[in-house]
């Protein structure tokens, strides 16, 4: 079928392939220090690493992309490592009317795949 | 707010930033010639191009990623160009019981963004 099994073992060696990694960032780093009050420091999970052939393919399109990249590397880019899902985070921030809590559903990655 | 407006004009020049591009592929290219009967050739829309700062940001996570990449380029990768939506395609293929039509919802990209 079109859905060849995506590979889950990294052929490039430990930590080289697409995975979730925690990055510490301050509100200053993000340019949010004037409107976000808390948390002052965020633990941001991000997707990093390479996407070798069929590794954690997001879908059929990603599998095709991987194959065509092998045939036409100048024309078709390799799949790249992006979030497959997110974990919500609540931020406390300034508003015109004072201070409020707001949930961000798309801020911190929870899983990664190659798309 | 966290949702800074994503940029829609490409600062790198025409055709350089993340966009949809048509790639011709035969069933042989895809390794599907033994089970897909039609079409013999596919027009595959793919997402190609670079993702400069805040260009077509998929969401808040992508905006953060762009910013942190500017601060820590060795640790945080730049956002990359991936499908934001797909257009379904029908393939005619062989099955154990003969020939059937099957819809693939995730085969051809319809839109792109930077994630």
């Amino acid at each position: 079928s079109a859905h060849a099994h995506p590979r889950d073992s990294c052929p490039l060696g430990p930590g080289r392939c697409c995975h979730l990694e925690t990055v510490q960032a301050t509100l200053e780093d993000l340019g949010w220090s004037d409107w976000v009050l808390s948390p002052r420091q965020l633990q941001l999970s991000m997707c990093v690493g390479e996407c070798p052939h069929l590794y954690r393919s997001a879908n059929t399109h990603a599998q095709i992309k991987a194959r065509l990249h092998g045939l036409q590397p100048d024309k078709v880019p390799a799949p790249c490592c992006v979030p497959s899902s997110y974990t919500p985070v609540v931020l406390m921030h300034r508003t015109d009317s004072g201070v409020s809590l707001q949930t961000y559903d798309d801020l911190v990655a929870r899983g990664c795949h190659c798309a | 707010s966290a949702h800074a407006h994503p940029r829609d004009s490409c600062p790198l020049g025409p055709g350089r930033c993340c966009h949809l591009e048509t790639v011709q592929a035969t069933l042989e290219d895809l390794g599907w010639s033994d089970w897909v009967l039609s079409p013999r050739q596919l027009q595959l829309s793919m997402c190609v191009g670079e993702c400069p700062h805040l260009y077509r940001s998929a969401n808040t996570h992508a905006q953060i990623k762009a910013r942190l990449h500017g601060l820590q380029p060795d640790k945080v990768p730049a956002p990359c160009c991936v499908p934001s939506s797909y257009t379904p395609v029908v393939l005619m293929h062989r099955t154990d019981s003969g020939v059937s039509l099957q819809t693939y919802d995730d085969l051809v990209a319809r839109g792109c963004h930077c994630a």
Partner: antibody, heavy 120, light 107 residues
Framework: QVQLVQSGAEVKKPGATVKVSCKAS????????MSWVRQAPGQGLEWMGY????????VYAQKLQGRVTMTTDTSTSTAYMELRSLRSDDTAVYYC?????????????WGQGTLVTVSS | DIQMTQSPSSVSASVGDRVTITCRAS??????LAWYQQKPGKAPKLLIY???SLQSGVPSRFSGSGSGTDFTLTISSLQPEDFATYYC?????????FGGGTKVEIK
């Protein structure tokens, strides 16, 4: 370890003002905000308000608006809660509670509590 | 304001029992629910945050679940030190609001 130590019990007359202090130790004081919660005798928990120890921004419960003021002194890592025009139904144990490092709107740890008795 | 309704208001149980406490929010709060334990004369102690995350140092017999409006705190095997009052608290919007509490008593 992280600790919040509150000032001692107070007895006040109706109409008076009380100021409760909460001294923090074991962490960077201005990195995490502080809420105040009270509990009337035999009753549940009532959130009073929040102060950002970093910026001084505050948000107060509607029913206490105009009577309560929350402040901080970063030089001594102390948060204060002042309640004015006291009434008998303000008799309660008052707690300071820091925002949790894991989730800004969860509270951990809590101070030991300060009993404020309003009686004529 | 978001109202938090806790049930039951009290429960009698024996050591070793499995105890379940529920909390319902008057509107969706995503997963922003915390659970606290309070013993007589003491300050509340955080057990669970973000609906299901166990606070550091809290025994694994405590667990939380749910999202949106319906949440549950479960004590898988009640220990003598678990007899206390338990409160839920929503953290999705100001004002922060607490449930009315559930007193877990010895049967």
């Amino acid at each position: 370890q992280v600790q919040l130590v509150q000032s001692g019990a107070e007895v006040k007359k109706p109409g008076a003002t009380v100021k409760v202090s909460c001294k923090a130790s074991g962490y960077t004081f201005d990195s995490l905000g502080m809420s105040w919660v009270r509990q009337a005798p035999g009753q549940g928990l009532e959130w009073m308000g929040y102060i950002s120890t970093y910026s001084g921004d505050t948000v107060y419960a509607q029913k206490l608006q105009g009577r309560v003021t929350m402040t901080t002194d970063t030089s001594t890592s102390t948060a204060y809660m002042e309640l004015r025009s006291l009434r008998s139904d303000d008799t309660a144990v008052y707690y300071c509670a820091r925002e949790s490092g894991q989730q800004v709107s969860a509270l951990d740890p809590w101070g030991q509590g300060t009993l404020v008795t309003v009686s004529s | 304001d978001i109202q938090m309704t806790q049930s039951p208001s009290s429960v009698s149980a024996s050591v070793g029992d499995r105890v379940t406490i529920t909390c319902r929010a008057s509107q969706g709060i995503s997963r922003w629910l915390a659970w606290y334990q309070q013993k007589p004369g003491k300050a509340p102690k955080l057990l669970i945050y973000a609906a299901s995350s166990l606070q550091s140092g809290v025994p694994s017999r405590f667990s939380g679940s749910g999202s949106g409006t319906d949440f549950t705190l479960t004590i898988s095997s009640l220990q003598p030190e678990d007899f206390a009052t338990y409160y839920c608290q929503q953290g999705a919007s100001f004002p922060l609001t607490f449930g009315g509490g559930t007193k877990v008593e010895i049967k």
